[in-house]
């Protein structure tokens, strides 16, 4: 199979085609299938795009959509490391409010230990 | 627990027209997109439509320009209309949740997940 | 558009036994390969989705393998309610489309 490794969106692939990019990844990457209209092309990425994680899995690694409700970008599919605007993370949730306890970190919009 | 129900099934005469309903319950509809799958009497699973959370539509060749499927997500409802019946339209309809087109979700949205009970069409003179 | 060919319509097995469907994709399609059971008189249940991944509440006797164009699911230990008809679907590009089937038959 011809892997058209001179085409930048064939990096990191070990299977790839002009017309759909990448069909396999290697090892350590994240398959990621960007769709354009009725067009699909995969791509081996390091990193997940934002609102993306990425899941291990024995035939392939890929990236997967962040799930947790109200959150812009997860460390896993349990868990989230950026809050929409308006919601507090706190242990890796979002909150339209912090706990009891909780002190909101304007800067960050991270729930903190303390006082209001 | 998710829910699906079918409705608007029946006899039909080719060339006429049914509009199929949809009823979704136990998730956050307007978060998911939703999709029709048809099976003919004593054969596969065919695809019907999509629809998108945002609404973009997908139909394969089959059915374009006849069907056209539409949500309303105050009323947790998915419908498709079907015009200009054939013969070959005759089948059991199911609405399934997910399998939107337009977005890689690499997770089970990808597939269909959940499935309703179906509801019958019958297109003959 | 691609063809999903599921080479056996129908496979014997008996209870306890290890069974293997088989679905082969036009093809490559990047593990995006779900499998669906269908019961007598009942509608589609996912089983598993992106060639690997098990659906909430499916046993874990039901596994699938491949990559590429050719993906197997796997019934370790057959039961009896695994009668059923088992259908491969592409989710990789539209228009989505689905193997043929196979019923599973218990002797």
């Known amino acids: 199979r011809a892997s058209y490794v001179s085409n930048p969106i064939c990096k990191g692939c070990l299977s790839c085609s002009k017309d759909n990019g990448c069909s396999r990844c290697q090892q350590k990457l994240f398959f990621f299938l960007r769709r354009e209209g009725m067009r699909q092309y995969g791509e081996c990425l390091h990193s997940c795009p934002s609102g993306y994680y990425g899941h291990r899995a024995p035939d392939m690694n890929r990236c997967a959509r962040c799930r947790i409700e109200n959150c812009d970008s997860c460390f896993s599919k349990d868990f989230c490391t950026k809050c929409k605007v308006g919601f507090y993370l706190h242990r890796g949730r979002c909150f339209d409010e912090c706990p009891d306890g909780f002190a909101p970190l304007e800067e960050t919009m991270e729930c903190v230990e303390g006082c209001e | 627990e998710v829910q699906l129900v079918e409705s608007g099934g029946g006899l039909v005469k080719p060339g006429g027209s049914l509009r199929l309903s949809c009823a979704a319950s136990g998730f956050t509809f307007s978060s998911y997109a939703m999709s029709w799958v048809r099976q003919a009497p004593g054969k596969g699973l065919e695809w019907v439509s999509s629809i998108s959370s945002g609404g973009s539509t997908y139909y394969p060749d089959s059915v374009k320009g006849r069907f056209t499927i539409s949500r309303d997500n105050a009323k947790n409802s998915l419908y498709l209309q079907m015009n200009s019946l054939r013969a070959e339209d005759t089948a059991v309809y199911y609405c399934a949740r997910g399998g939107d087109p337009g977005v890689y979700n690499g997770d089970y949205e990808d597939a269909m997940d959940y499935w309703g009970q179906g509801t019958t069409v019958t297109v003959s003179s | 558009d691609i063809v999903m060919t599921q080479s056996h319509k129908f496979m014997s097995t008996s209870v306890g036994d290890r069974v293997s469907i088989t679905c082969k994709a036009s093809?490559?399609?990047?593990?995006?390969v779900a499998w669906y059971q269908q019961k007598p008189g009942q509608s589609p249940k996912l089983l598993i989705y992106?060639?690997?991944t098990r659906h909430t509440g499916v046993p874990d006797r039901f596994t699938n393998s491949g990559s590429g164009t050719d993906y197997t699911l796997t019934i370790s230990s057959v039961q009896a309610e695994d009668l059923a008809l088992y259908y491969c679907q592409q989710h990789y590009s539209t228009p989505w489309t689905f193997g043929g089937g196979t019923k599973l038959e218990i002797k």
């Open positions: 093809q490559d399609v990047s593990s995006a």
């Open positions: 992106w060639a690997s």
